[in-house]
Each structure stands twice: as C-alpha cells, then as structure tokens.
C-alpha cells in the first residue's frame, strides 16, 4: 500500500507564438482545479478507460479575473498535493492523465459551470520510494509543469511497496535472519508472513500465508512468468511448466468489488463498476459529495449534499458514465466520406482521408487531372483519387505517348489479315468471311448471315474499321 503524489507547479501559456486567451474574464471570473487518473502498466491512455490505480481531484484554486489587455499569465493554482492512495503493490510502470478544469463563477443558472481546459497524458516508469520526478507537458498552447512520486505507507517499503518493516525490538541489531530496512536503517524487515516460498521479487501478501502475484507472474508462489502464447483453457494458459495461467478461481470469484459494485473480468485482471457515490479500484472509496465536483465535462451534480447521500450527475449531450467521464462514440455514425478514418478528439471530429481525397469530411475528390496533359489528343478521366488517360485511336500508355499497334491484339477473326492504318486498322478477310473484323460468315448461296455488305464492298474485300 502507498500513495502517489502529484504537485502542480504551474499552468500557463507555453513557449512560442499563439499565446492562449485567458480562460477567465472580468465578466466571468473563474478558478482552476485538477484531476489525475492513474492506470497500471503502459496501458492505452484513452480518457474513458477506468482509472484502475485510482483518481483524485484537487481543491479549487484562488478566484482569478483577467486583467484587460494583459497576456494570460501562469494561473493561480490550488494549494496542496493531489494524492492517489493505492492499496496493492505499486506497479512500477503506469500511465497518467492530468486534466485542468475551469470552474466559471459568473451568474450561472444552477450553480457553477465546469469545462475542460487541457488534458495531458503520458506513460512513465517510477519506483516507489524514489525522489520527486519533474515533468513538463504541453496541451495545445498551454503548458503544465508538475512533479510526482510514489511513496509507501508504513509498514510497507521497497520499490513496489511489497516488503514490510517493523521498528527494531533491540537498539543494536535486527533479529536472526532479518535485514535492516533500507532506507529506514532504524527498522527491520518484518518476519516473513507470506506463504513459504512466495517469490520475494514477483509476489507479495497482505495477509499472513497468502502469495499474490505482481502483473506478469503466476503460479502458487508467483514464480511462473505469464505467457502471452495461446492456451486452451477458458481462463487462458493452463500449464505451470509453459508459464500459462492456471485455471481455477477467476479474478471476480468472491466479488472483490465493495459497496455493491459489480465485477467484470478483463484480460489481465478485473474491473469494478461502482454504484453512485463510490469509486476506486474496488469501489472502496466513498464520501464524495457534489461539493467535490464529481461530474466532469459540464455535468450537473444533484443530491449528494452530505457523504451519506449519493449524488447523480446529469450529463450534457455527448457524455455519459456515472461521472459524465465517458464520451459517446460519435464516429459510429460514420461521418467521414470516401473511406476516411474517423477520429473523435473530444472537442471535434476529425477525418483522416485516403489518398486522393481531402476536406474536413474527405468530401473533396482531388483533381488529379489538374496540370496533367494526355498526349496525342487523349482526354483525362478522374476516378477514385487517381487519373487515367483515355487515348485517341492509335495511341496508348499512361499519358498516350506510346504509339499503339492496333493489330497487336489480333482483332481480325477467322484468319483475316490485319493492316495498320492511320485511322485505325483494316482487316483483309479470308474467303467465306466478311465484316469489319471478318466476323460474319458468307453462306454458300452468296447471302450473308447478317445484313449484306455495304454497297460497293464485295465479300473478301478488305474491310476498313473506323
């Protein structure tokens, strides 16, 4: 167990041109607050996925009113740290989202209005017990400077907060087989309380006799690395020798979610869906009221005047979730045209267009014929973002620059002889056949199977094909 601590140093305009407008004005004074969301491992940073390691809201900062004509300075910040307690081992690698929120204090009907000013996200490695790590992140024209650290809560120590320490019973040394607890040299490692043989690197325990595994390890003593290879058991890999997960109790067995939360299995662990008024990895954190501002994205908080009564967030259009923290999937309406890829950026929809298309919704077919001449009288034809030339008779190739051999395809049927001609080709038909391509047989009685040859042409005469 331990606490992740975040210290915001400054939030203001970043370097470079295009300084952002101040978020507050004389007519609309406002104040800032921050939200941090932590997820274990180097997971995707989707804002909507649960904050499995925990989340925290800062206090509100001092009220700020813009000075007319002055550039936006660093804005006044809330006092104190943001603290996210974690109950289990510290994972070592984590993803974070830090959101800067503005609370407008004008004459709002129904109380203050909240809006998201900036969101930064990242993935980091961090050992518990280490020094403060400093970071700078940019979101558009804004810049956020902050420090963070993870520290263990006594009696836990170590880079993952999995070792336990106790004060020394004797002033001079620790008991037999027990080492001093670095960096707390005046304390000793507690007697081994985990299951005998439980891996000291990959396992930990919170109760005597148990052995719980860190992410990526399995087996009764947490000595078997989890394989990502396919295994046949319904819970995934099944053989301890191959490093496969052992079938048996699932992560939701016994429902680890407190306070009426419902449990669902995830590929690596479990996820609790908490009832209103509770949050945290196992729905163990309660006591949130509307005064804590639990509704995000401009949601309106109702009820929850005291910690014993649940609050309800009424979400604005386009947002959902018990805290209005999830965005509705607007891309499912497929607004992008011509095979464009839809991206919901929150403040707007964007389309990533296929080659040959452009525009906010990929609605413009780029004119591939612009500036492209087809030689020798050919005409340019557009289609699908590519251009092609429809060539005049006797020419071919991409730009109609190649002289085509009209006889190359052997167009004369029934043994007719082909002659190239300036306006096309001419077929000299074998006896018994006629037509531009010698396609019609001449019947023995002299009548053709199809209309007679044009006046002035006898069967067997060369037929010019125009």
């Amino acid at each position: 167990a331990g606490v992740f601590e975040l210290q915001i140093h400054s939030f203001g305009p970043g370097p470079g041109p295009g300084a952002p407008r101040s978020p507050c004005s004389a007519r609309l004074p406002c104040r800032l607050f921050f939200r941090v969301c932590l997820k274990p491992g180097l997971s995707e940073e989707a804002a909507e996925s649960p904050c499995a390691l925990g989340a925290a809201l800062s206090a509100r900062g001092p009220v700020y009113t813009e000075q007319p004509g002055a550039p936006a300075p660093d804005l006044p910040l809330p006092d104190g740290l943001l603290q996210v307690p974690f109950r289990d081992a510290w994972p070592g690698t984590f993803s974070f989202i830090i959101e800067t929120w503005r609370e407008e204090l004008g004459d709002q009907i129904g109380g203050p209005a909240w809006s998201l000013l900036a969101r930064v996200a990242g993935r980091r490695r961090l050992a518990a017990g280490g020094p403060w790590a400093r970071d700078i992140q940019r979101a558009g024209a804004w810049e956020l400077r902050f420090s963070y650290r993870a520290r263990c809560e006594p009696p836990a120590v170590g880079t993952a907060c999995t070792r336990l320490c106790r004060p020394r019973s004797a002033p001079s040394r620790c008991g037999p087989g027990l080492r001093p607890c670095a960096p707390l040299e005046d304390e000793c490692e507690a007697p081994l309380v985990c299951r005998a043989g439980c891996s000291p690197e990959h396992g930990f325990c919170e109760q005597p006799g148990e052995c719980r595994c860190l992410e990526g390890w399995t087996g009764p003593l947490c000595t078997v690395p989890v394989s990502t290879s396919s295994c046949l058991s319904p819970r995934g890999p099944s053989s301890a020798t191959t490093g496969c997960l052992v079938p048996g109790p699932g992560p939701c067995d016994g429902n680890p979610c407190a306070n009426g939360g419902s449990c669902s299995e995830t590929p690596r662990s479990f996820e609790c869906t908490c009832p209103r008024g509770f949050y945290g990895l196992r729905c163990e954190v309660s006591g949130v009221t509307c005064a804590d501002g639990p509704c995000f994205n401009g949601g309106l908080c109702v009820g929850g005047a005291d910690p014993d009564s649940a609050y309800i967030c009424h979400c604005p259009p386009g947002f959902q979730g018990s805290n209005c923290e999830k965005r509705v999937d607007r891309c499912s309406l497929q607004p992008c045209r011509n095979g464009g890829l839809c991206l919901d950026l929150g403040h707007a929809l964007r389309c990533r267009c296929r080659a040959g298309f452009a525009g906010p919704r990929c609605e413009h077919d780029l004119d591939d014929c612009a500036g492209r001449a087809c030689a020798n009288g050919g005409t340019c034809v557009e289609g699908g973002g590519a251009h092609r030339c429809s060539c005049a008779l006797g020419f071919g190739g991409r730009d109609c620059r190649e002289r085509a051999d009209p006889c190359a395809a052997r167009p004369c049927a029934h043994g007719g002889r082909c002659y190239a001609h300036f306006s096309g080709l001419v077929c000299a038909c074998a006896p018994g056949y006629m037509g531009a391509r010698c396609e019609f047989p001449v019947h023995p009685d002299g009548a053709s199977a199809l209309p007679a040859a044009p006046p002035g042409l006898r069967p067997g005469d060369p037929q010019r094909y125009l």
Partner: nanobody, 120 residues
Framework: EVQLVQSGGGLVQAGGSLRLSCAAS????????MGWYRQPPGKQREMVAG???????IYADSVKGRFTISRDNAKNTVYLQMNSLKPEDTAVYYC??????????????WGQGTQVTVKP
C-alpha cells in the same frame, strides 16, 4: 445555432410500433450524417440507425429487420420507424447530426432525447 427537435416516443406494448422524428433547423449549409442513438437505463449510449457521410444506411445488429430509418431532405428531417418492439428497446432515444454550417465548418449536434418504454 443549430437545433435538433425530436418528437414521437412514449409507452407501447411489446410487439407494437412507434415512429420518431427529428427535424434539424438553423444555420445549416448541409447535413453530412444523421441518425439515432439510444441509451438504455444504466448502460452506454449506442448507435441505432443512421445515414452515413457517404449516404449509406447503417443499423445496429440488434434492430436490423425491425427498425427503418428514412429521411426527407427538403425538410432536413429523419424518421425512425420502430416495429416489433421488445422490452430491451426501452431507452432514451437521441437524434444526432453531423452538420456543415454556413461557415463551412462541421459540428456534431444532439437532440434533446425522447423516452421510449416497451412494456412486456
């Protein structure tokens, strides 16, 4: 300013029918995509049926063969005809539209929501 005004909805017995309509008005140059979403109690909002940017018609698997979306381009209106309704169709139904404004920008808008309740 663009408004999506919804009408229809209400209470119906399982197996019955309802028709929803949604009219878009305001500074609209063109409607790029328009359709219907729904949000059952305690669940996520999901797309039900729509006209895509390419003009195709799309439906959620759960409503195929029962719901039909149609439109009147002259009135900037879409309709959702819901037949063979089931209790699991109970939800708040939202109209949604991706609109090109006179400014040539595109914006996504939502209607106010309409309750549809299907009794077993």
């Amino acid at each position: 300013e663009v408004q999506l005004v919804q009408s229809g909805g209400g209470l119906v017995q399982a197996g019955g029918s309802l028709r929803l309509s949604c009219a878009a008005s305001g500074s609209i140059l063109s409607i790029n995509a328009m359709g219907w979403y729904r949000q059952p109690p305690g669940k996520q909002r999901e797309m039900v049926a729509g006209f895509t940017g390419d003009g195709n018609t799309i439906y959620a698997d759960s409503v195929k063969g029962r719901f039909t979306i149609s439109r009147d381009n002259a009135k900037n209106t879409v309709y959702l005809q819901m037949n063979s309704l089931k209790p699991e169709d109970t939800a708040v139904y939202y109209c949604a539209a991706d609109v090109q404004l006179f400014s040539r920008d595109y914006e996504f808008y939502w209607g106010q929501g309409t309750q549809v309740t299907v009794k077993p």
